[in-house]
């Protein structure tokens, strides 16, 4: 008689990443008997919730349920029914909700309340919705990429599983760019982390890690753009803002009330003699770069060295994975290749920003104009942040790897978050049982 395959003994987990500009649902899967092994959890599905981030529903919280329906239904379809009740669901909200909470704790609580009620209606094991800290966001992103790269495994492999993987156990640093915040996380080389707020200690798989992390609230690409506009309109002579970060020929009317809606622009707020102003693109990379640099205060540093705004940053060490919007923007601009030097990236950005808006619209007809119009700014911002903000150089640029997925799983904080909450990263190295790592295929 033929051998019948035994039913898969697998487990599933769901994490919703409620970001400032959108929400994504991730479904993870792993063999039940290998929970403590490194690298066994993988992503089986990403469902991007259709619409903006949850913080935008503050005036219509009763509609959050509709907004989440489609992706929760997708989870119901992907995960076998027999597994529904034991599948944990976690929702973590990031900087968009941190900003809303700064404005009104009550409103932020109301949004999370409705999110919790909506998610509790599904047959899964809902574990709660919360606003994660910037420190957690950085730390979990770092755990995710190093877990997927196999950096926590004690067994050195003779092969590489991803193109940029070095064969040693040196961890990768993590660079995460969102819409409202950006995180930098890495293990510095024998360096004291001078500010306790930026220090994390982990013991993972029997090894100790002293990790530096910082999250810069308001320095995600969308909030950085609002900051830049608020700063530049202060010195505009009238309601026309000639902006080097937008393509020549581009025009857009901005409401002053929208500009000052976010806490991120409070420091630039002033009474203006107009309710609206018009952005007129002039498409000049160099001037755009200069304007962005004015958002980084580098005149004050109470430590041996800083990133910007008086925030401690140790000397950069090792390779870095740059993901989320770092990747999406650079991918759109076709600048993710390992072979592209920093000088080449700058050159390409100069050309891209100088292209007329009408030409850009024709070349990228399938892209929404709002997104399309902001790639010049976003690309320039990424260069400014990495070079002047974090002190990467033309030489160390080659240590930045723009990563979308590793082994089919998205780079980001969600996997690390789930691994932590399901206790799947042991402090000590698990005792290896014969063949438990599928040594023989």
């Amino acid at each position: 008689t033929q051998n019948k395959a035994l039913p898969e003994n697998v487990k599933y987990g769901i994490v919703l990443d409620a970001g400032s500009s959108h929400t994504s649902l991730y479904i993870y899967k792993w063999p039940a008997e290998k929970e403590n092994d490194t690298g066994v959890v993988h992503q089986v599905e990403e469902c991007r919730v259709k619409g903006p981030g949850i913080s935008k529903f503050v005036q219509k919280v009763n509609e959050i349920g509709i907004y989440l329906t489609d992706c929760m239904e997708r989870a119901r379809e992907v995960i076998p029914r027999s597994q529904h009740q034991e599948t944990p669901v976690y929702l973590g909200a990031t900087a968009g909700m941190r900003l809303l909470r700064m404005e009104s704790e009550e409103l932020a609580d109301r949004v999370l309340d409705v999110v919790e009620r909506s998610l509790s209606n599904y047959p899964f094991d809902f574990q709660g919705a919360r606003i994660i800290t910037g420190q957690e966001e950085g730390a979990y992103g770092w755990i995710t990429i190093n877990y997927l790269l196999g950096k926590f495994s004690q067994k050195t492999r003779w092969f590489s599983i991803v193109p940029y993987e070095t064969n040693n156990q040196e961890t990768f640093g993590a660079l995460d760019l969102g819409g409202a915040s950006t995180q930098v996380t890495f293990v510095p080389q024998n360096q004291t982390i001078e500010s306790p707020d930026n220090a994390l200690q982990f013991r993972l798989y029997g090894k100790d890690y002293n990790v530096y992390t910082h999250s810069f609230l308001c320095y995600g690409k969308d909030q950085a753009l609002w900051q830049k506009l608020a700063k530049d309109i202060q010195v505009a002579s009238n309601e026309i803002l000639r902006d080097p970060c937008f393509h020549p020929g581009y025009k857009k009317v901005v409401n002053v009330s929208d500009l000052y809606k976010t806490p991120c622009t409070k420091r630039f707020e002033m009474t203006l003699p107009f309710q609206q102003f018009e952005i007129q693109g002039i498409g000049n990379y160099q001037q755009c770069h200069q304007s962005i640099l004015e958002l980084f205060n580098t005149s004050y540093c109470p430590y041996s060295q800083c990133a910007f705004n008086g925030i401690f940053l140790p000397p950069l060490q090792g390779d870095f994975g740059a993901f989320s919007a770092f990747y999406f923007v650079m991918k759109f601009l076709n600048l993710t290749s390992e072979k592209v030097s920093q000088e080449k990236v700058t050159e390409m950005m100069k050309k891209f920003c100088a292209q007329p808006w009408e030409e850009i619209k024709t070349s990228y007809a399938g892209v929404k104009e709002k997104y399309l119009s902001e790639y010049c700014f976003s690309g320039t911002y990424i260069l400014s942040l990495l070079l002047q903000g974090y002190h990467f150089t033309a030489d160390s640029w080659e240590h930045i790897h723009f990563i979308g997925k590793i082994q089919g799983s998205d780079a980001g904080w969600t996997l690390g978050y789930m691994l932590n909450l399901t206790n799947m990263i042991p402090a000590e190295q698990p005792l290896s049982t014969p063949l438990s790592h599928s040594t023989y295929v």
Epitope: C47, K50, G51, Q59, K60, G65, I66, N121, K368
Partner: antibody, heavy 121, light 106 residues
């Protein structure tokens, strides 16, 4: 402003296949699911299926499964619905549509103008 | 699949009269959406998420309900309101529509 423009009317013989297109503009193509709905003459509305251009994932109504294929061409922001093994009861107007929340959390629902498919020998 | 049953199938009214259309679901849904359709036109979203009027829909329209029973009400019929109305659930797949209610002039 979101626009969905469908291909023109089709006359097909029983047993043949038909492929209808729906070109979208005014938004980022990967942002929303694209749905297909059938309306036979003088009858009600029937959901056929949808596609998520972001992931490429499709869902079909069991009633049409096996005969319908929904695809997309991201380069032209166009969705297609192909119906095979046509029979007379497939004579209908077919609509493409999308719905969801825009960047300001306003709900919207937009439909194409419809494509009449006539199945007749 | 969730079956939606609309009643009545036809409603004959005069301008100024009140119209009430019901939609009953075979199992509980979180929200109901309503569409208006006129001859030769694509359906138009009229009420979304049970009670929210779509853009441009007059205030004489209202929606209510929960669970399995939902209602669309027109407080005082105007000539342009005579059309076919469909309910639709988007809570679970496959998405389903009610059979429609034709509101005609008496």
């Amino acid at each position: 402003e979101v626009q969905l423009v469908q291909s023109g009317a089709e006359l097909k013989k029983p047993g043949a296949s038909v492929k209808i297109s729906c070109k979208v503009s005014g938004y980022s193509f990967t942002d929303y699911n694209l749905n297909w709905v059938k309306q036979a003459p003088g009858k009600g509305l029937e959901w056929i299926g949808n596609i998520d251009p972001y992931s490429g994932g499709t869902r079909y109504n069991q009633k049409f499964k096996g005969r319908v294929t929904i695809t997309i061409d991201q380069s032209t922001s166009t969705a297609y619905m192909e119906l095979s093994s046509l029979r007379s009861e497939d004579t209908a107007v077919y609509y493409c549509g999308l719905y969801g929340y825009d960047d300001d959390a306003n709900y919207f629902d937009d439909w194409g103008q419809g494509t009449l498919v006539t199945v007749s020998s | 699949e969730i079956v939606l049953t609309q009643s009545p199938a036809t409603l004959s009214l005069s301008p100024g009269e009140r119209a009430t259309i019901s939609c009953s679901a075979s199992s509980s849904v979180s929200y109901m959406h309503w569409f208006q359709q006129k001859p030769g036109q694509a359906p138009k979203l009229w009420i979304y998420a049970t009670s929210n009027l779509a853009s441009g829909v007059p205030a004489r329209f209202s929606g209510s309900g929960s669970g399995t029973d939902y209602t669309l009400t027109i407080s005082s019929m105007e000539p342009e309101d005579f059309a076919v109305y469909y309910c639709q659930q988007r809570s679970s797949y496959p998405l389903t529509f009610g059979g429609g209610t034709k509101v005609e002039i008496k």
